[in-house]
């Protein structure tokens, strides 16, 4: 009752290994690391056969098949490259995930290298079987910004791609007769979120309470250069409009808001986020130079009713920008206190502009980002949002523009976006 000699499968072994096998002897067939027992098209770790009474084995010896990790999972905003020839996905094969540069960057500078494990899963030394994350790169325009610029009042055209975070926000309340329509600017923070000033998104019909405009009335344009040609721009409706809960319409304290876009926008040379600053109550240092862009009124003598009667034609057709120095807080406070009226420049604001005037932001630039280049991270950071100024004409002597100090609201912004700050560390100015 002796059974025939057994040949172990290629890349496998049989245990116990004996010269002879008799009735009731059992053999366990297993495969080398990275191989699986294959029997009748079923994969298993081991397979047992038995020597029968009639001197035959209960089953044929199975084969050993190399483990296949199959096609790796798609990475949002990422690419996969195969290290092995013929795009092999079997045991010990290597793949490399990378992000769509220069618009996305891998979180935590991960290598992105995954190896097909003996268990049949793609494994990374740090992340294990989890996929890496591609985060939008921030504050790095595809075009470098020139050092010498003039003003929005008086006009200097921005080249396409200079301010890829710039958003045009159009609010049109069609529930009103006549339709109420206005515009402002905003800054892209991620593929789904726009930062702007709260007063841009507040319904002025209500003064006794601060009520945001209905999200159905908000349209956001990104990648827009010339307002006469919106064909190249990405337009998105709003999924949510979030005003800062403490926004005060008396003095514009806490003038900050967020719009969540209905769908994430594809990033590219003309659509890229700006970086958020560190959480720091001091805000930007006095005399630091910042840039602001906008399609607001570029002629200081245009009245609001002229804008309305001509539609959006008194918007600057082409995006304008200006370079302005941060004004010491005390100087700005004094300049407003000396005016008739209870203008209060709070600790949540900073001022920018020139004593002699001539360069300024204006009506319609509201909500736009005042950006400063951070030498350490080599990125543009949103330090301010165009908030208020006046009451004199834009660009008047000793009438500084007042900006929301974004660094006071970093935690609030992350909280609204639902992202813990640690997860998005690359987006924070270092």
């Amino acid at each position: 009752n002796e059974c025939p000699e057994l040949q172990p499968p290629v890349h496998g072994k049989i245990e116990p290994s004996q010269a002879k096998y008799f009735f009731k002897d059992q053999v366990l067939v297993s495969c080398d690391t990275g191989y699986k027992v294959l029997k009748d098209n079923v994969e298993m770790d081991t397979f047992q056969i038995e020597c029968l009474k009639d001197g035959t084995w209960s089953n044929k010896i199975p084969t050993c098949k190399i483990v296949d990790c199959r096609a790796p999972g798609e990475l949002e905003h990422g690419l996969i490259t195969f290290s092995t020839r013929n795009n092999l996905t079997t045991y010990k094969s290597e793949i490399k995930y990378s992000c769509q540069e220069p618009y996305y960057k891998m979180l935590n500078n991960n290598t992105g290298i995954y190896t097909c494990s003996a268990q049949g899963v793609w494994m990374n030394k740090v992340l294990g079987r989890s996929l890496p994350t591609c985060l939008p790169e921030c504050g790095q325009p595809s075009r470098s910004l020139p050092s010498l610029v003039k003003r929005i009042i008086g006009g200097r055209n921005a080249e396409p791609g200079l301010f890829p975070w710039q958003a045009l926000i159009v609010v049109e309340d069609t529930s009103r007769v006549p339709n109420d329509k206005w515009f402002g600017s905003g800054a892209l923070l991620s593929a789904s979120w726009i930062l702007t000033a709260a007063h841009v998104l507040r319904s002025q019909r209500r003064d006794t309470t601060v009520i945001p405009v209905s999200k159905e009335h908000v349209t956001v344009y990104l990648g827009l250069h010339d307002v006469r040609d919106k064909s190249g721009a990405v337009n998105s409706s709003a999924a949510r409009v979030v005003l800062h809960p403490d926004f005060n319409i008396q003095n514009y304290n806490h003038d900050i808001a967020l719009v969540q876009l209905q769908e994430p926008v594809p990033l590219g040379p003309h659509v890229m986020p700006v970086c958020l600053p560190r959480l720091e109550p001091e805000g930007p240092a006095p005399h630091m130079l910042g840039l602001v862009a906008g399609w607001g009124i570029s002629n200081p003598n245009v009245t609001v009713d002229e804008i309305i009667s001509s539609g959006t034609r008194t918007l600057s057709d082409v995006l304008q920008y200006v370079k302005l120095p941060v004004v010491p807080h005390a100087e700005c406070k004094t300049s407003y206190e000396s005016r008739s009226g209870n203008y209060s420049v709070t600790e949540n604001m900073f001022c920018a502009g020139y004593y002699e005037g001539g360069k300024d932001t204006c009506l319609g630039d509201s909500g736009g980002a005042f950006v400063i280049f951070d030498d350490l991270s080599q990125r543009w950071v949103v330090q301010g949002l165009v908030s208020w100024g006046g009451p004199e004409e834009c660009g008047s002597k000793q009438v500084y523009g007042v900006y929301t100090k974004v660094s006071n609201y970093v935690d609030w912004v992350w909280e609204q976006m639902g992202l813990p700050q640690s997860v998005v560390e690359p987006q924070v100015e270092r």
């Epitope: 006549p178 329509k181 007063h199 002025q204 019909r205 006794t208």
Partner: antibody, heavy 116, light 112 residues
């Protein structure tokens, strides 16, 4: 500190045009709308409409559509009410008041007399 | 248009006594945002109107707490717990919920 100061009394003949000003101070002008209210001698108040000082869009009550126009000069923090083709029944006092729904600060009123 | 009906037309009160003015609207003033945009204003003789109460019951700063506003839906009341000489004038209710916004006809408060 918040004030709305209106222009002085006006004496006009029928068919003429009058433009009343309302200068705001003490707050950010574009943060509140301006509402216009009519008060005939010895009578009650009548809501004429309001203008959004941020967008510049005016809204008129039905009785004030046509000959009445609200406008702004934002750089001067001033709102205007213009009445064209004046009629005798336009003889009244016109008030400007702050807000679309606040009506918390009022101008002193501008008396318009239309007489041939 | 929403009609705002005030009662009484004239109210003669002795100083130190309470007073009550009613304002009824032809439609509910509860807005879709959950707030009721009803205000009370006082116009003293020869002066501009002055807001006393907004959002039905909120007192403006500087307004004495002897004034109270109450009500909901279509029925609203302004009460003065103890009338003083400076309270004389015409009281108006005003709704800011439905376009066109409308004022009540006014209630003249006289001192007996």
């Amino acid at each position: 500190q918040i004030q709305l100061v209106q222009s002085g009394p006006e004496l006009k003949t029928p068919g003429e045009t009058v433009k009343i000003s309302c200068k705001a101070s003490g707050y950010i002008f574009t943060s509140y709308g301006i509402t216009w209210v009519k008060q005939a001698p010895g009578k009650g108040l009548k809501w004429m409409g309001w203008i959004n000082t941020y967008s510049g869009v005016p809204t008129y009550a039905d009785d004030f559509k046509g000959r009445f126009a609200f406008s702004l000069e934002t750089s001067a923090s001033t709102a205007y009410l213009q009445i064209n083709n004046l009629k005798n029944e336009d003889t009244t006092t016109y008030f400007c008041t702050r807000g679309g729904d606040a009506l918390d600060y009022w101008g002193q009123g501008t008396s318009v007399t239309v007489s041939s | 248009d929403i009609v705002m009906t005030q009662a009484p037309l004239t109210l003669s009160v002795t100083i130190g006594q309470p007073a009550s003015i009613s304002c009824k609207s032809s439609q509910s003033l509860l807005d879709s945002d959950g707030k009721t945009y009803l205000s009370w204003l006082l116009q003293r003789p020869g002066q501009s109107p002055k807001r006393l109460i907004y959002l039905v019951s909120k007192l403006d700063s500087g307004v004495p707490d002897r004034f109270t506003g109450s009500g909901s839906g279509t029925d609203f009341t302004l009460k003065i717990s103890r009338v003083e000489a400076e309270d004389l004038g015409v009281y108006y209710c005003w709704q800011g919920t439905h376009f066109p916004y409308t004022f009540g006809g006014g209630t003249k408060l006289e001192i007996k």
